[in-house]
Interface confidence: low
């Protein structure tokens, strides 16, 4: 059986304050 494709793949960008308020770095969001 084919598994349903997960459309909630992560998008990762270098960002400051996006994932954590004092961190600059790669931040991944689904």
């Amino acid at each position: 059986r084919r598994r349903r494709r997960d459309t909630h793949f992560p998008i990762c960008i270098f960002c400051c304050g996006c994932c954590h308020r004092s961190k600059c770095g790669m931040c991944c969001k689904t």
């Epitope: 400051c16 304050g17 994932c19 954590h20 308020r21 004092s22 961190k23 600059c24 770095g25």
Partner: antibody, heavy 122, light 107 residues
């Protein structure tokens, strides 16, 4: 080496304002946030607030937010904390500290300034 | 606001003994957001432990941290003379708060 150097001690009268500076060196200033912490004589540590050096976002302790302003000057890698309408119970040592992150978790206030004593007295 | 309660307020022990310091949170704290500091008289605090159990750079292995949820512990396995100072726990949630501190004194 990584360090935070604060401005000198201050004596102020009640009702006045004080502005303490915190100059960073040895790391990329805009990649980290700065928290300010104070300690009244013989007392514990009180967190005052935070500023993101990269975007100027702030988060202030509820009991101080009406009187405190935190800013940064990225051209000189310096953070500032201004406290207005000073009272005698604002007499304390004021510290700036770098807020560290390691992967996905908070890695503590990992670098501290030497402290600035602010005395409020008439 | 998360309130951190440290106990005991003062701990009286002898050099070489084991010290157990407790930090209890008023609500659950992610282990990733719990840190411990040491403060010597007249000095700025120094980071000891972050992420509840990770030692900061240069911290001797006699210091260790553990815990999760609302209960966290700092253990000093063998007290050295320079360890008889004040220790604070601190959490980072929506904002940052410190515990009231534990003073470790010589018995």
């Amino acid at each position: 080496q990584v360090q935070l150097v604060q401005s000198g001690d201050e004596v102020k009268k009640p009702g006045a304002s004080v502005k303490v500076s915190c100059k960073a060196s040895g790391y990329t200033f805009i990649k980290y946030g700065i928290s300010w912490v104070r300690q009244a004589p013989g007392q514990g540590l009180e967190w005052m607030g935070w500023i993101g050096a990269f975007n100027g976002n702030t988060d202030y302790a509820r009991n101080l937010q009406a009187r405190v302003t935190m800013t940064t000057d990225t051209s000189t890698s310096t953070a500032y904390m201004e406290l207005r309408s000073l009272r005698s119970d604002d007499t304390a040592v004021y510290y700036c500290a770098r807020e560290g992150w390691n992967d996905d978790y908070f890695s503590g206030l990992d670098v501290w300034g030497q402290g600035t004593t602010v005395t409020v007295s008439s | 606001e998360i309130v951190l309660t440290q106990s005991p307020g003062t701990l009286s022990l002898s050099p070489g003994e084991r010290a157990t310091l407790s930090c209890r949170a008023s609500q659950s704290v992610s282990s990733n957001y719990l840190a411990w500091y040491q403060q010597k008289p007249g000095q700025a605090p120094r980071l000891l432990i972050y992420g509840a159990s990770s030692r900061a750079t240069g911290i001797p292995d006699r210091f260790s941290g553990s815990g999760s949820g609302t209960d966290f512990t700092l253990i000093i396995s063998r007290l050295e003379p320079e360890d008889f100072v004040v220790y604070y726990c601190q959490q980072y949630g929506s904002s940052l708060t410190f515990g009231g501190g534990t003073k470790v004194e010589i018995k």
